[in-house]
């Protein structure tokens, strides 16, 4: 081949260095963004997926840009603007990252964005047959109207005192508020 650095074989600003052995008369040290034995190939820098969190990669030749999705920022979209870092979920809740916004997975009995609100266990009117629902530290309790029993006042009490349950739970009286 006989090509040497004197022939200017390195393209795109590549630096030519004379080879250390007869089989390689020169070596091209390519600038960022180019590759190949003569720096003739442009590197598709976006193929390395440098933009995190779903950011769009733009190879501008002289530079690489990331267009970030909502909720993310930084040269490589690496900063979650609303992530769990430094953000606490109250009342035993755990923080879950995703989609550019943090979310709290709340412990039983709590709700809201940061688990600061007490959940309303009575919202769905769980106490049947006129039962009165109370929010309770253990969840909810139903005060059953006379003639009904069960955790949700779902079982009628028969006139003879028996209920529609196969067997009445121990220690419960018909009409008792149930946990």
């Amino acid at each position: 081949s006989g090509v040497t650095c004197a022939d200017g074989p390195c393209f795109n600003g590549g630096l030519c260095v004379g080879g250390a052995d007869p089989d390689s008369a020169y070596i091209c040290h390519c600038p960022p963004g180019f590759q190949g034995s003569n720096c003739e190939k442009r590197v598709d820098r976006c193929s390395l997926q440098p933009c995190r969190n779903g950011g769009l990669c733009l190879d501008l030749g002289h530079a690489l840009r990331c267009r970030c999705r909502a909720g993310f920022a930084g040269p490589r979209c690496e900063h979650d603007l609303d992530d769990c870092a430094g953000r606490a979920c109250a009342n035993g809740g755990t923080c879950v990252e995703g989609g550019g916004a943090h979310r709290c997975s709340c412990a039983l009995g709590f709700g809201g964005r940061d688990c600061r609100e007490r959940a309303d266990p009575c919202a769905a009117r769980p106490c049947a047959h006129g039962g009165r629902c109370y929010a309770h530290f253990s969840g909810l309790v139903c005060a059953c109207a006379p003639g009904y029993m069960g955790a949700r006042c779902e079982f009628p009490v028969h006139p003879d005192g028996a209920s529609a349950l196969p067997a009445a739970p121990p220690g419960l009286r018909p009409g008792d508020p149930q946990r």
Epitope: E117, C122, A124, R132, C133, A135, P146, P177
Partner: antibody, heavy 123, light 111 residues
Amino acid sequence: QEQLVESGGGLVQPEGSLTLTCTASGFSFSSSGYMCWVRQAPGKGLEWIACISGGSSGDTDYANWAKGRFSISKTSSTTVTLQMTSLTVADTATYFCARDVYIDSTIFNFNLWGPGTLVTVSS
Amino acid sequence: QVLTQTPSPVSAAVGGTVTISCQASQSVYNNNNLAWYQQKPGQPPKLLIYAASSLASGVPSRFKGSGAGTQFTLTISDLECDDAATYYCQGTYYSSGWYSTFGGGTEVVVK
């Protein structure tokens, strides 16, 4: 510190209307049982009026005599109102807001009261 | 439903005992859903006893509730001047809906 404060009382003419407000601090209604109104005519005994669920169900209970003229509603997680219409001299009383909690399988336990607001119906 | 309290007023000396009766025209909910309140002039009522015989938080054991169904009693022993007040019983009922009624009140005078 858990507290209830009533407001909106005052002088109103017979057949007039008035809305009383109960505001809670130190707790939110959704974490408690029911919020209720009780009244007391000057020198007389206590008279239960109505209750509303502290949660979002909005379930209500009324004394028979109060149905139609009195309306209880929850306007936020810390405020409850009592709307009173067609007022008569007999409605002159101090109106108390009270919290009804479930304790040991019993209900209508008024364990927290406001100081009351005086409503005077007079021409 | 009517709750009748007797007697009124009731009077006793410091250190003495008073007993107030509350008679319901029909059984209260669960036979025990009856509460007692203490009210002093210019103040809201204060819950003393719930579930007929259970002492509310912070209430001294000198106050004792008893009874079931339609007949209930509040006993105050070792009377103190601070016990001078009006006492109300309150019953809960269910009949096509929940409701509550108060007794007429009993004034306790401490001599």
